[in-house]
């Protein structure tokens, strides 16, 4: 990964665009730390493995997080 060894944060730009939970391969929530001062949300899409940074403050993204955690709680026994 070109910048990973030298940068603290992962996201260059962030997106407000809602993501269909069905098209998600993975959703990573990286908490703020000494390496990066802000929460970062990285969505990995099933199509082509595209990774997209999402805006943690966006209403649509907050709804997505709720939907994903609901889905997870349904699956876990």
């Amino acid at each position: 990964v070109p910048l990973s060894r030298t940068v603290r944060c992962t996201c260059i730009s962030i997106s407000n665009q809602p993501v269909n939970p069905r098209s998600l391969e993975k959703l990573e929530i990286i908490p703020a730390s000494q390496f990066c001062p802000r929460v970062e949300i990285i969505a990995t899409m099933k199509k082509k493995g595209e990774k997209r940074c999402l805006n943690p403050e966006s209403k649509a993204i907050k709804n997505l997080l709720k939907a994903v955690s609901k889905e997870r709680s349904k699956r876990s026994p």
Epitope: V1, V7, R8, T10, C11, I12, S13, E50, K51, C53
Partner: antibody, heavy 124, light 109 residues
Framework: QVQLVESGGGVVQPGRSLRLSCTAS????????MHWVRQAPGKGLEWVAV????????YYADSVKGRFTISRDNSKNTLYLEMNSLRAEDTAIYYC?????????????????WGQGTTVTVSS | EIVLTQSPGTLSLSPGERATLSCRAS???????LAWYQQKPGQAPRLLIY???SRATGIPDRFSGSGSGTDFTLTISRLEPEDFAVYYC??????????FGPGTKVDIK
């Protein structure tokens, strides 16, 4: 509409300084990484610098490292390029460009919006 | 440092013909990091393709990108009069972080 407008170019002597500005409108500037790219007369494109949406990530081309500084003021929707110790080879059109939505260090969405450029001429 | 080479330097074609532009990297480049741009005289560049094969918003489907590793291709299936321009490939990688190829000029035969 989505727009980037550069300003601050002009004729300057070698060794002097200049500050370029790029004013954004029509989109939420504070959510996008921004670049400076230049093009010398009759030549191809040369990337100069990038800054992330929050200003945490800043990278420079080797040709300008230590002389140029990229910065942004999200409250003013403005990107800057501070250029010091200017050389004749810095003569070019300077474009500001927006990094694609959601771009990150793992996936590059390209530079999807460009300004029309501002001309910098370094000459004695 | 990864160097991008574009060929041919100039491509002379007629409207309606197919254009195939090549971009070769000196080392392997992830397709996640490869983009193509179009630039017309006196204008700013315009993003055509990102991720080696994904069309940017508003780009007609006659433009397509393909390739992986060190060899990438931009194809224009049927040239329209407005497609005559210079095309640049670009990669995002280690220092210098973003690199453009030297460009391919597509001109009218």
């Amino acid at each position: 509409q989505v727009q980037l407008v550069e300003s601050g170019g002009g004729v300057v002597q070698p060794g002097r300084s200049l500050r370029l500005s790029c004013t954004a409108s029509g989109f939420t500037f504070s959510q996008y990484g921004m670049h400076w790219v230049r093009q010398a007369p009759g030549k191809g494109l040369e990337w100069v610098a990038v800054i992330s949406y929050g200003g945490d990530i800043k990278y420079y081309a080797d040709s300008v490292k230590g002389r140029f500084t990229i910065s942004r003021d999200n409250s003013k929707n403005t990107l800057y390029l501070e250029m010091n110790s200017l050389r004749a080879e810095d003569t070019a059109i300077y474009y500001c460009a927006r990094e694609g939505e959601g771009s990150n260090i793992y996936y590059y969405y390209g530079m999807d919006v460009w300004g029309q450029g501002t001309t910098v001429t370094v000459s004695s | 440092e990864i160097v991008l080479t574009q060929s041919p330097g100039t491509l002379s074609l007629s409207p309606g013909e197919r254009a195939t532009l090549s971009c070769r990297a000196s080392q392997s480049v992830s397709s996640s990091y490869l983009a193509w741009y179009q630039q017309k005289p006196g204008q700013a560049p315009r993003l055509l393709i990102y991720g080696a094969s994904s069309r940017a918003t508003g780009i007609p489907d006659r433009f397509s990108g393909s390739g992986s590793g060190t060899d990438f291709t931009l194809t224009i299936s049927r040239l329209e009069p407005e497609d005559f321009a210079v095309y640049y490939c670009q990669q995002y990688g280690s220092s210098p972080i973003f690199t453009f190829g030297p460009g391919t000029k597509v001109d009218i035969k």
